[in-house]
């Protein structure tokens, strides 16, 4: 059957921990992505930012997991109003910020 939302979020959190701790070199070679507002709809916004990083196997599983939280199909070059379009940050910092926010959402029971 389908994975419960709480389990899916916990698994996403644990995957973000894994990719941040297993990096010897800068994550995704220091690629930059658009920063996002961590509000409603931020799963799609996060996916829209990360999907523009190519050739980075470390975040492929994260991209797949985020797609499970986003109700619509996301493709490269797509941007929502949730992006802070004048601010780009390294993927590693993006993941770190996203991770802390998701841990708080998990505590609050906001699983989807």
């Amino acid at each position: 059957g389908p994975v419960p939302p709480s389990t899916a979020l916990r698994e996403l959190i644990e995957e973000l921990v894994n990719i941040t701790q297993n990096q010897k070199a800068p994550l995704c070679n220091g690629s930059m992505v658009w920063s996002i507002n961590l509000t409603a709809g931020m799963y799609c916004a996060a996916l829209e930012s990360l999907i523009n990083v190519s050739g980075c196997s470390a975040i492929e599983k994260t991209q797949r997991m985020l797609s499970g939280f986003c109700p619509h199909k996301v493709s490269a070059g797509q941007f929502s109003s949730l992006h802070v379009r004048d601010t780009k940050i390294e993927v590693a910092q993006f993941v770190k910020d996203l991770l802390l926010h998701l841990k708080k959402l998990f505590r609050e029971g906001q699983f989807n």
Epitope: L16, T20, L100, K103, R107, E108, G109, Q110
Partner: antibody
């Protein structure tokens, strides 16, 4: 000001019972999860139990499960810990602790009482 | 049950930086809180949610959390910082709160 005051500690024989109470004041008691934490002499902190803001859920440390019961009375702003079948290893200072309530009780403990000493000895 | 491992003691000279670690399996997936306890007193919250600091706590106190280790850092250490420090997480698999064993910080 915000305050938690524990009472009910004392000396008790192994196998006997004791009830600790905690009086809360200075904040909206019914909106907070409440915990008991204990500390044996010269030892570290050990979490004992939690009760949700509305009393709907309780969780216990394995070491006290089945022996201790946490309850609250939101109309009187009081928290209780009923301790049965006490053991020598239950000897500790018992702290009443406040934590903001979320879906998970993963919030930090932002207000502590001064503690009440429980000594279990024959 | 979930286990948090802290060094029993850390010593540092005044003005130096103290680093206290808290190890746990994938602790980076959990929100970590830190408490300071001085002899004969109740614990006081110094860091919550990995890295946030209560308003009354000096900026010298900071926290981080990644992978299998959370860290409490106290910069420009003062004699008044001498205390026991405890890390804490909620184990959502067992529905229990867990404390580390504590670290005694000695200011030389």
């Amino acid at each position: 000001q915000m305050q938690l005051v524990e009472s009910g500690g004392g000396v008790v024989q192994p196998g006997r019972s004791l009830t600790l109470s905690c009086a809360a004041s200075g904040f909206e008691f019914r909106t907070y999860g409440m915990h008991w934490v204990r500390q044996a002499p010269g030892k570290g902190l050990e979490w004992v139990a939690v009760i949700w803001d509305d009393g709907s859920n309780t969780h216990y440390a394995d070491s006290v499960k089945g022996r201790f019961t946490i309850t609250r009375d939101n109309s009187k702003n009081t928290l209780n810990l009923q301790m049965n079948s006490l053991r020598v290893e239950d000897t500790a200072v018992y702290y009443c602790v406040r934590a903001p309530q979320w879906y998970l009780t993963a919030e930090a403990f932002d207000l502590w009482g001064q503690g009440t000493m429980v000594t279990v000895s024959s | 049950s979930y286990i948090l491992t802290q060094p029993p003691s850390v010593s540092v000279a005044p003005g130096e930086t103290a680093t206290i670690t808290c190890g746990g399996n994938l602790i980076g997936a959990k929100l970590v809180h830190w408490y300071q306890q001085k002899p004969g007193q109740a614990p006081v919250l110094v860091i919550y949610d990995d890295s946030d600091r209560p308003s009354r706590i000096p900026e010298r106190f900071s926290g981080s959390n990644s992978g299998n280790t959370a860290t409490l850092t106290i910069s420009d250490v003062e004699e008044g910082d001498e205390a026991d420090y405890y890390c804490q997480v909620w184990d959502y698999y067992a529905d229990t709160m867990v404390f580390g064993g504590g670290t005694k910080l000695t200011v030389l």
